[in-house]
Interface confidence: low
Amino acid sequence: QPVLHQPPAMSSALGTTIRLTCTLRNDHDIGVYSVYWYQQRPGHPPRFLLRYFSQSDKSQGPQVPPRFSGSKDVARNRGYLSISELQPEDEAMYYCAMGARSSEKEEREREWEEEMEPTAARTRVP
């Protein structure tokens, strides 16, 4: 069983909000990790979207629109990526990753968990 699990595909209508889920295996505690989200469009490498540890400890990638936001459900051991006002260019692969929370937050190298699995979020014209 992989350390991280994401559903293989999701779809939603343009203009709506979609929430992608990243579930951490039960022998790990999401409460001690930052959740990182990446977007990968066809022909491009993955790009950093955001990091979420808590409401008071999070960071957005430069120029990443606020339509992209992170959250966590510690009880369910899950991280979430919400994308509001879905646009055609949001059709992409989305990757989550867990990183050890560091005291210097974004300034320090991250330690990656073993595995990252993709979620494909596909927008469709209603």
């Epitope: 990182y36 990446y38 977007q39 066809p42 022909g43 491009h44 490498p45 993955p46 790009r47 950093f48 979207l49 990638g61 430069p62 120029q63 990443v64 055609p88 260019e89 990753a97 974004e106 300034e107 320090r108 190298e109 991250r110 990656w112």
Partner: antibody, heavy 117, light 107 residues
Framework: QVQLVQSGAEVKKPGSSVKVSCKAS????????INWVRQAPGQGLEWMGG????????NYAQKFQGRVTITADKSTSTAYMELSSLRSEDTAVYYC??????????WGQGTLVTVSS | DIQMTQSPSSLSASVGDRVTITCRAS??????LAWFQQKPGKAPKSLIY???SLQSGVPSRFSGSGSGTDFTLTISSLQPEDFATYYC?????????FGGGTKVEIK
């Protein structure tokens, strides 16, 4: 404050190789891609390739495929571009640039590579 | 590869002039277009991303527009520090490609 500092100018013989470094500071190195762009004297900008540091995958322009290797050392937050089988047409300023989700915002100062016999 | 064609290749203008530079892609690139400014001996500087979004710290006299294949960079009132070469770049797909550049010179 994000900074990309490149290695110094190089003079190389035709047929040899050059390795240019690009040290990043002020940000999470593994969160971004590093692109390499070159500019021959009096010419425009030409993308050579890039590497996504966190994921390790590199992508190269067809023109340079087999001659260029882009790598990154996470422990020193440094990216490298090695170009082999140098010829006179490779004389150019080589830039590294950080890909910030949309496009390259932060650029190194440039490294002049001169290929001459 | 996607070809990016910029026009004009050079232009002469005076301080205060409105300047327009166009960039055409050989195929549709949505809004995945950036504009850069480069001065002699310096690295390029990002002005516009996503075709029309102004980079942080860039004066509002710079604006971008367009989608698909046709794009425009406009300088509403040319300032002395704006004399430089401007490049468009598509990042819709690899390989990333630049336009040939437009040199803005003093008339």
């Amino acid at each position: 404050q994000v900074q990309l500092v490149q290695s110094g100018a190089e003079v190389k013989k035709p047929g040899s190789s050059v390795k240019v470094s690009c040290k990043a500071s002020g940000g999470t190195f593994t969160a971004y891609a590093i692109n390499w762009v070159r500019q021959a004297p009096g010419q425009g900008l030409e993308w050579m390739g890039g590497i996504n540091v966190g994921f390790g995958g590199a992508n190269y322009a067809q023109k340079f495929q087999g001659r260029v290797t882009i790598t990154a050392d996470k422990s020193t937050s440094t990216a490298y571009m090695e170009l082999s089988s140098l010829r006179s047409e490779d004389t150019a300023v080589y830039y590294c640039a950080r890909d910030d989700y949309w496009t390259s915002v932060y650029w190194g100062q440039g490294t002049l590579v001169t290929v001459s016999s | 590869d996607i070809q990016m064609t910029q026009s004009p290749s050079s232009l002469s203008a005076s301080v205060g002039d409105r300047v327009t530079i166009t960039c055409r892609a050989s195929q549709g690139i949505s809004n995945y277009l950036a504009w850069f400014q480069q001065k002699p001996g310096k690295a390029p500087k990002s002005l516009i991303y996503a075709a029309s979004s102004l980079q942080s710290g860039v004066p509002s006299r710079f604006s971008g527009s367009g989608s698909g294949t046709d794009f425009t960079l406009t300088i509403s009132s040319l300032q002395p520090e704006d004399f430089a070469t401007y490049y468009c770049q598509q990042y819709n797909s690899y390989p990333l490609t630049f336009g040939g550049g437009t040199k803005v010179e003093i008339k």
